[in-house]
């Protein structure tokens, strides 16, 4: 094929492939018609003036993994048509101005994981039909006004995984065709008002894993096409009361991790497209009437991991679509009998790890198709009577760990347990607190002196899909989950969507945090 | 381009286990759920669970509980289907899906892995 | 489990013609705001490919002549003008509860 490197792969469709750590230089000679070369994991160290020189015809370069670190400005001359180069995982700590000279048709530029300390704005100024620009994973630790402000086409900007300590209100401002940016893992503290104001097409932003303790109440006003906006894994202590006000489009927004104390009623603005709202790890201490009634299509929200003592009758105002409800792992002692009334489509109910003492007998009365309650781990004592007869879908009921008092006034509780017995589940059944002479023996079969009916176990419907809430108070620091740290579930066959297996047999949830590019 | 693609077919032995991997690409993998469907020969389509890469997360089908594990490696953008204790009955076409919210439709598939337990 | 019956199990329809299809099941999968239903099309050799999702939204690129309809219990996929790439095997889903399929119905031209 118009002369094949011995060191590489040539193919009939004009791609060239070079890889072996016995290349350290640019083979030679290069198939003239060729219009894809890739040069990987090689030993090549440097690229010098011109190795492309006779394939002018090349579309897509990728040099990635290699041991470059160095690059003479005029390394990639007589590319002009070339639409795409990578020279990802490398080790360049500088970029040489005018390296992507005459370079007319580049519209993808991956550059990340390098070692890459700073870029200019004479890196890209030549690069007015770029679409996409990969800089995540680099040492840069802050963006020159007028870096990118020859990148109008720009649709995709990566700067996540960098050491970027704070941005400048106008760095993005001539980005109007930007549609994604990620800013995540970096070390950004705060947000300037204005930032994102010129970023009127944007849909994807991500924040997370930032220190970002505040937010400016009209920072995101002008982004009406966002779609996800990541803000997870922050210091974020108070939301202003319009900030999420004008993102009619947002389908994905998460707001874990963070240390939010408090959500004023309306703060989630009109989302018609939110379906899932995650704020577990944070330290709400209550929830107002009407916090989430702008959220009709939500389906999904979890609360867990907070310090939530008091919910408002209202709370739940508006969520007539909630599928999944988590409140473990808070600090409730009561619940208002209504408190769950709007939720007429709830499956799925996570209470557990809690300090409820009683439940109100109505507590579940409009929440007919509820199939998994968790409220093992809290101070309960006794149940109302019949506060499960109406829940004809109920297959995953969890008890265990409650100090339950076993005295006459257990007989009803106990013979509805008797019955409804593999609802219960086979891991852990619930024991008898109180009196002493009982304690640790099964509630369901205990002796309390009375007659028990003979009873018929009836068939239970078949498991349903149970939800997952994040328990853990520690995360992995790999990025990869495999079935050592898989989920437990507190419902049988519903793995908690947030668990890792620790050190107790507690559902816990692990996050791992991983953005690809 | 939306992208999910699914490792060889696999020929195994009854008993033994098999895993299945599903690279995903053009899009960001955490972002998604990733739902895994059975198609026997000349049968439809079951539903084997689903894994949400962002936090591992898993959801079975009780009936395939202690069958299937699902897993991930968020570096490598790959999610993973084991199945243990293989039998006849579990020969099948194995696909993964992309799903944007649990309750979603699966947007896009992967071309499907074929398993054949066979002694 | 919510089971899913389609009908017909096969369908032949000449081309330009419509052709209908029906998922039942025994319980509601709707709420006030959306049916938990879609629809898949699978060809021989490929994996099945989204048609409508929630009832009745019509999945990014697919042709108008699909249409979904349908609340509560009985759902109908309708294809108004059979084209011959729309020869293929048509599964309902729902994610109300675990998923489930239908079994699939064979549409064929006449």
């Known amino acids: 094929y118009h002369g094949c490197p011995s060191e590489c792969t040539c193919s009939r469709a004009s791609q060239v492939e070079c890889t072996g750590a016995r290349i350290v230089a640019v083979p030679t000679p290069l198939p003239w018609n060729a219009m894809s070369l890739q040069i990987l994991n090689t030993h090549i160290t440097e690229l010098n003036e011109s190795p492309f020189l006779n394939i002018s015809a090349l579309i897509a370069l990728r040099i990635e993994k290699n041991e470059l670190s160095r690059i003479t400005p005029g390394a990639f001359r007589n590319l002009g048509s070339l639409r795409y180069l990578s020279l990802a995982n490398n080790k360049l700590q500088v970029l040489p101005i005018g390296l992507f000279q005459g370079l007319d048709s580049l519209e993808s530029l991956l550059l990340s994981s390098n070692q890459l300390l700073q870029i200019q704005p004479a890196h890209f100024s030549q690069c007015s039909n770029l679409k996409e620009l990969q800089l995540h994973g680099n040492h840069l630790e802050y963006i020159p006004d007028g870096a990118f402000d020859h990148l109008v086409g720009l649709t995709k900007l990566n700067l996540g995984k960098n050491s970027l300590t704070h941005i400048s209100p106008r760095v993005f401002q001539h980005l109007g065709n930007l549609q994604v940016l990620r800013l995540y893992e970096n070390r950004l503290t705060d947000i300037p008002m204005g930032t994102f104001d010129g970023l009127v097409n944007l849909q994807e932003l991500a924040l997370q894993q930032n220190q970002i303790g505040l937010l400016s109440p009209g920072l995101f006003h002008n982004n009406h096409n966002l779609q996800r906006l990541y803000l997870s894994n922050n210091h974020i202590s108070q939301l202003p009361p319009s900030v999420f006000m004008q993102l009619p489009q947002l389908n994905r927004l998460t707001l874990f991790g963070n240390s939010l104390k408090e959500l004023s009623p309306g703060i989630f603005g009109p989302m018609p497209n939110l379906r899932e709202l995650w704020l577990y790890d944070n330290h709400i201490s209550s929830l107002p009437d009407n916090v989430f009634s702008n959220l009709r299509q939500l389906q999904v929200l979890i609360l867990s991991r907070n310090q939530i003592s008091f919910i408002s009758p209202g709370a739940f105002n508006g969520l007539t679509e909630l599928r999944e409800l988590s409140l473990h792992t808070n600090a409730l002692q009561d619940l208002d009998g209504n408190v769950f009334r709007m939720l007429a489509n709830l499956q799925n109910i996570s209470l557990q790890n809690n300090r409820l003492r009683q439940l109100p007998g109505n507590i579940f009365a409009n929440v007919n198709g509820l199939m998994a309650i968790q409220l093992q781990n809290n101070q309960l004592e006794n149940l109302p009577l019949g506060i499960f007869d109406h829940l004809g879908k109920l297959c995953e009921l969890r008890l265990y760990d409650n100090p339950w008092r076993c005295d006459s006034d257990i007989l009803p509780l106990r013979n509805w347990l008797l019955l409804n017995q593999p609802r219960l589940g086979t891991d852990t059944v619930p024991v008898c607190f109180s009196p002493a002479n009982v304690r640790g023996q099964s509630l369901i079969i205990i002796n309390v002196n009375v007659a028990v009916p003979s009873v018929h176990v009836p068939e239970v419907p078949s498991y349903p899909e149970t939800p997952w809430y994040p328990d853990t108070p520690s995360y992995p620091d790999t990025t990869s989950v495999s079935s050592t740290t898989e989920l437990t579930s507190p419902v049988e066959d519903y793995t908690d969507l947030t668990t890792i297996q620790v050190t107790d047999d507690r559902s816990v949830w692990g996050m791992t945090q991983a953005q690809s590019g | 381009e939306v992208q999910l693609v699914q490792s060889g077919a696999e020929v195994k032995k009854p008993g033994s286990s098999v895993k299945v991997s599903c690279k995903a690409s053009g899009f960001t993998f955490t972002d998604y759920y990733i739902h895994w469907v059975k198609q026997a020969p000349g049968q439809g389509l079951e539903w084997i669970g689903l894994?949400?890469?962002?936090?591992?997360?898993?959801n079975y089908n009780q009936k395939f509980k202690g069958k299937a594990t699902l897993t991930v490696d968020t570096s490598t953008t790959t999610a993973y289907m084991e199945m243990s204790s293989l039998r006849s009955e579990d020969t099948a076409v194995y696909y993964c899906?992309?799903?944007?919210?649990?309750?979603?439709?699966?947007?896009?598939w992967g071309q499907g892995t074929t398993v054949t337990v066979s002694s | 489990d919510i089971v899913l019956t389609q009908s017909p199990d096969s369908l032949a329809v000449s081309l330009g013609e419509r052709a209908t299809i029906n998922c039942r099941h025994h319980q509601s999968v709707s709420t006030s705001s959306y049916s938990y239903m879609h629809w898949y099309q699978q060809k021989p050799g490929q994996p099945p490919k989204l048609l409508i999702k929630y009832a009745s939204s019509l999945e990014s690129g697919v042709p108008d002549r699909f249409s979904g309809s349908g609340s509560g219990t009985d759902f109908t996929l309708t294809i108004s003008s059979l084209q011959a790439e729309d020869v293929a095997v048509y599964y309902c889903?729902?994610?109300?509860?675990?998923?489930?399929f239908g079994g699939g119905t064979k549409v064929e031209i006449k």
């Open positions: 889903e729902q994610s109300w509860e675990i998923r489930t």
């Open positions: 899906a992309r799903g944007d919210n649990k309750y979603d439709a699966m947007d896009y």
């Open positions: 894994v949400y890469p962002y936090i591992g997360g898993t």
